[in-house]
């Protein structure tokens, strides 16, 4: 007897973190042999949506015209052959940015550090926020992601730096979000060039590097050292 | 007992619209998927599309795709179908139908029907 | 679209008969079809499903069998409420498409 049918691929263009509005399109892609493909949403009853297979069959396109809330969550999809259905693939966590306006990124004491020395990357919103994250350009996860204690409600979050090295240059933005749905995510900061100076290193990245699927020194969590930041906020590396 | 309950008979003139409501009570509506079909005098049945309640995804028929509009009001627990540029050929019983998603995606409950005559 | 042919349209038949239907799909519908029992001036019902699944309520005499293109609808002993219009109906893909309908009458 036949093992179980191998899981789909699930996946979203341009990507999984949407701006409020924007399209987005969902690819399941299965086999030649599959008659349906069934997309289902995390607490959603019914199937979320079914879609007939594309030529020549193998996947099958779920359309979102204009991002909204009720879009953002948790997604995966089945696909139907003549022998029954596949196992569910890997979830797909659909982001929505735009939710909340956005927060302020600032460095203290300034963005210009120089190399040895400590900075803090200061994310502060204007209403109060469980959730704040740290995202650095071309950086393939989120730095750091600060959730607070018991829910409490904070208007900024600290992430520290120490000591600086030519990796922690380049452009960054913070989100703020609340902990009741992390699928949706403020409108980004402004960016913030963090400049290093005092090392011989190009403290940017270059533009033609690829992220390389291992996880180098741009995908780590940036360990600040010293206490837990002051504002109260519990610290999670992604 | 799951019950659909369908809006009244319509008369329309060539070129209008028409808008036929179906009632889900019984179970969890937004639950299952929901079925639009119509049956012409006479004739057989036609499938038009169907919704889901849930989230308001739909699929329509492609013979219908730039006429016919579903939507859905979770909060009465109905399911509309709209259908616009009406002609003759349009006269028809129309039937709500609920999926029952599992082996066959097969119609397991339906509406009583709603007459929609079309005629100048 | 899959295309549904029931035969045949009509056909007359006497209590207590055994009476078969059958149903072709354009392509291989891998089981995906269903059978419907519609009386004049009334919404369809649901009979069987899944080809050979008979719907909560309906009386046993009534049974589906086939696989790929070719479906039956088999009645084993005619009731005098079972005359009536029976039609097939692919789930197997969108657009979901039904068979013309086979008239059972009284002979």
């Known amino acids: 007897q036949a093992g179980p049918l191998p899981k789909p691929t699930l996946w979203a263009e341009p990507g999984s973190v949407i701006s409020w509005g924007n399209s987005v399109t969902i690819w399941c892609q299965g086999t030649l042999e599959a008659r349906e493909y069934r997309l289902d949403k995390e607490e959603s009853p019914a199937p979320w949506d079914r879609q007939n297979p594309l030529e020549p069959k193998n996947k099958a396109r779920f359309s979102i015209p204009s991002m909204t809330e009720d879009y953002a969550g948790r997604y995966r999809c089945y696909y139907r052959s003549p022998v029954g259905w596949s196992q569910p693939s890997d979830p797909l966590e659909l982001v929505m940015t735009g939710a909340y306006s956005k927060p302020t990124l600032s460095a203290l004491p300034s963005p210009l550090v120089t190399s040895g020395k400590s900075v803090t990357l200061l994310c502060q919103s204007r209403s109060p926020m469980d959730t704040f994250l740290l995202i650095k350009e071309r950086a393939a996860h989120p730095l750091l992601h600060l959730r607070s204690e018991h829910g409490a409600q904070q208007h900024q979050a600290e992430f520290p730096m120490s000591p600086v090295t030519s990796v922690h240059g380049g452009t960054y933005r913070c989100f703020s979000s609340h902990g009741f749905s992390h699928y949706l995510l403020s409108h980004p900061s402004d960016p913030l060039e963090l400049i290093v100076s005092g090392s011989l290193e190009d403290p940017r990245p270059s533009p033609t590097r690829s992220v390389s699927t291992a996880a180098g020194p741009e995908d780590q969590p940036l360990m600040p050292t010293g206490s837990v930041p002051h504002s109260g906020l519990r610290r999670h590396w992604e | 007992q799951v019950q659909l309950v369908q809006s009244g008979a319509e008369v329309k003139k060539p070129g209008a619209s028409v808008k036929v409501s179906c009632k889900a009570s019984?179970?969890?509506?937004?639950?299952?998927?929901m079925h639009w079909v119509r049956q012409a005098p006479g004739q057989g049945l036609e499938w038009m599309g169907e919704?889901?309640?849930?989230?308001?995804?739909?699929n329509y028929n492609e013979k219908f795709k730039s006429r016919v509009t579903m939507t859905r009001d979770t909060s009465t627990s109905t399911v509309y179908m709209e259908l616009s540029s009406l002609r003759s050929e349009d006269t028809a019983v129309y039937y709500c139908?609920?999926?029952?998603?599992?082996?066959?995606?097969?119609?397991?409950?339906w509406g009583q029907g709603t007459t929609v005559t079309v005629s100048s | 679209d899959i295309q549904m042919t029931q035969s045949p349209s009509s056909l007359s038949a006497s209590v207590g008969d055994r009476v078969t239907i059958t149903c072709r799909a354009s392509?291989?519908?891998?089981?995906?079809l269903n059978w419907y029992q519609q009386k004049p001036g009334k919404a369809p019902k649901l009979l069987i499903y899944?080809?050979?699944r008979l719907h909560s309520g309906v009386p046993s005499r009534f049974s589906g069998s086939g696989s790929g293109t070719e479906y039956t609808l088999t009645i084993s002993s005619l009731q005098p409420d079972d005359f009536a219009t029976y039609y097939c109906?692919?789930?197997?893909?969108?657009?979901?498409?039904f068979g013309q309908g086979t008239r059972l009458e009284i002979k």
């Open positions: 919704i889901n309640p849930s989230n308001g995804r739909t």
């Open positions: 019984g179970y969890t509506f937004t639950s299952y998927w």
């Open positions: 392509q291989d519908i891998t089981n995906y």
């Open positions: 139908a609920r999926d029952r998603y599992d082996e066959g995606n097969a119609m397991d409950y």
């Open positions: 899944y080809t050979s």
């Open positions: 109906q692919q789930g197997d893909t969108l657009p979901r498409t």
